[in-house]
């Protein structure tokens, strides 16, 4: 039972769902399912039958390898896909692929929440704003990353003159894309441009 593969792809891309091992020899039937009860395509006795589903017209089966090609995947295509092979012995085998479709992250906007000159030090609070996405944040000061503990949507830090940076970059990323937003300050502690 335990063949489960995870795949993460970017929305709008073309995807190939396949297994890493070779198919059982001289199999009788091969079926791809979307969730456990919806057939996408079935190969049986030298012909493929495509079922009425949201995939009709954008899927193709390669019976040699068992690969299923899906064009223009969308977030709604997130699911567990199952390939079932019926062997000549009259028993079957299943492979499962958990497909996660992610949109590319949008370019973030850096909001300056607070800049304050405090005895030659600069108190800085910047927020990196992107619409409701589950992403990772990385902050850079003049291309040097800030410590791990400061890596979230808000950068709050007090900078001393020796580690003062001119430009601050927020990089937002998910497993399929990343985008940067940058804000630059004029020394000692004022906004220049974004």
């Amino acid at each position: 039972q335990g063949h489960l593969v995870h795949m993460t792809v970017v929305s709008g891309s073309n995807v190939t769902l396949n297994i890493s091992e070779s198919l059982p020899e001289n199999y009788k039937q091969l079926t791809w399912f979307y969730t456990f009860d919806q057939k996408i395509v079935e190969w049986d006795s030298r012909k493929s039958k495509y079922f009425e589903s949201k995939f009709k017209g954008r899927v193709r089966l390669d019976p040699q390898s068992g690969a299923l090609y899906i064009s223009k995947v969308q977030k709604e295509d997130n699911s567990t896909y199952i390939m079932r092979v019926l062997k000549k012995t009259g028993n079957e085998q299943e492979w499962k692929i958990k497909l996660q479709v992610l949109d590319p992250v949008p370019k973030p906007v850096i909001k300056i929440e607070k800049i304050e000159d405090m005895d030659d030090n600069c108190y800085l609070k910047l927020s990196c704003v992107i619409p409701g996405e589950s992403v990772n944040y990385t902050w850079y000061g003049d291309k040097r990353p800030f410590p791990k503990e400061l890596q979230n949507s808000v950068l709050e830090t007090t900078l001393m003159p020796h580690n003062y940076s001119r430009c601050y970059t927020c990089q937002v990323s998910n497993s399929v894309s990343s985008k940067n937003g940058t804000v630059c300050l004029s020394p000692p502690c004022t906004l220049a441009r974004s």
């Epitope: 039972q1 009788k28 456990f36």
Partner: antibody
Framework: QVQLVQSGAEVKKPGASVKVSCKAS????????MHWVRQAPGQGLEWMGG????????SYNQKFTGRATLTVDKSTSTAYMELSSLRSEDTAVYYC?????????????WGQGTLVTVSS | DIQMTQSPSSLSASVGDRVTITCKAS??????VAWYQQKPGKVPKLLIY???TRHTGVPSRFSGSGSGTDFTLTISSLQPEDVATYYC?????????FGQGTKLEIK
């Protein structure tokens, strides 16, 4: 070995709801879909629906859509079937049955059955 | 929904007889057909799947055949313990459907 143990017999009034449980053991609960089949006295077998315990995806016989609800509790490896708005025709033995695979709903393993009697 | 029509609905045969039960699907189901045996007051027991594959522990006198729309369960030599109701089931397409059953008795 695979075992499916169902809750005990129930007597219900018309219009009421019943919830039958099916506790699975002897295998990895999330690796096989669980289905519910009922049998009215002296009648044949009727498939009600199935659930994938891993994802929570469900599939229902249209006859029961809106009245039957299938759920699982992964922490206790238990499947549930709730049937609402009961009528006398729902008097039957209700079985849970484990599919051989996620996608192959043939049933080698069955619960012992739960008799639900609907009577005023 | 796919209808599964069994015939006969009941039959009586002698010990040692060859018994045949048929099941007709209302549309092509390939070989995705199973057969079950249910004795009075007992849970159904899987006999045959993929139309012709015998389930583990099922005696060799039980065999299945067919594909497409026509399927057959055969008991080559009827034994007293085979008294039961037999059901066919298609699992090609949801919703899953069963035949209405064939009640087998000994003469």
């Amino acid at each position: 070995q695979v075992q499916l143990v169902q809750s005990g017999a129930e007597v219900k009034k018309p219009g009421a709801s019943v919830k039958v449980s099916c506790k699975a053991s002897g295998y990895t609960f999330t690796e096989y879909t669980m289905h519910w089949v009922r049998q009215a006295p002296g009648q044949g077998l009727e498939w009600m629906g199935g659930i994938n315990p891993d994802t929570g995806d469900t599939s229902y016989n249209q006859k029961f859509t809106g009245r039957a609800t299938l759920t699982v509790d992964k922490s206790t490896s238990t499947a549930y079937m709730e049937l609402s708005s009961l009528r006398s025709e729902d008097t039957a033995v209700y079985y849970c049955a484990r599919a051989q695979f996620w996608t192959t709903p043939r049933f080698a393993y069955w619960g012992q059955g739960t008799l639900v009697t609907v009577s005023s | 929904d796919i209808q599964m029509t069994q015939s006969p609905s009941s039959l009586s045969a002698s010990v040692g007889d060859r018994v045949t039960i048929t099941c007709k699907a209302s549309q092509d189901v390939g070989t995705a057909v199973a057969w079950y045996q249910q004795k009075p007051g007992k849970v159904p027991k899987l006999l045959i799947y993929w139309a012709s594959t015998r389930h583990t522990g099922v005696p060799s006198r039980f065999s299945g055949s067919g594909s497409g729309t026509d399927f057959t369960l055969t008991i080559s030599s009827l034994q007293p313990e085979d008294v039961a109701t037999y059901y066919c089931q298609q699992y090609s397409t949801y919703p899953i459907t069963f035949g209405q059953g064939t009640k087998l008795e000994i003469k």
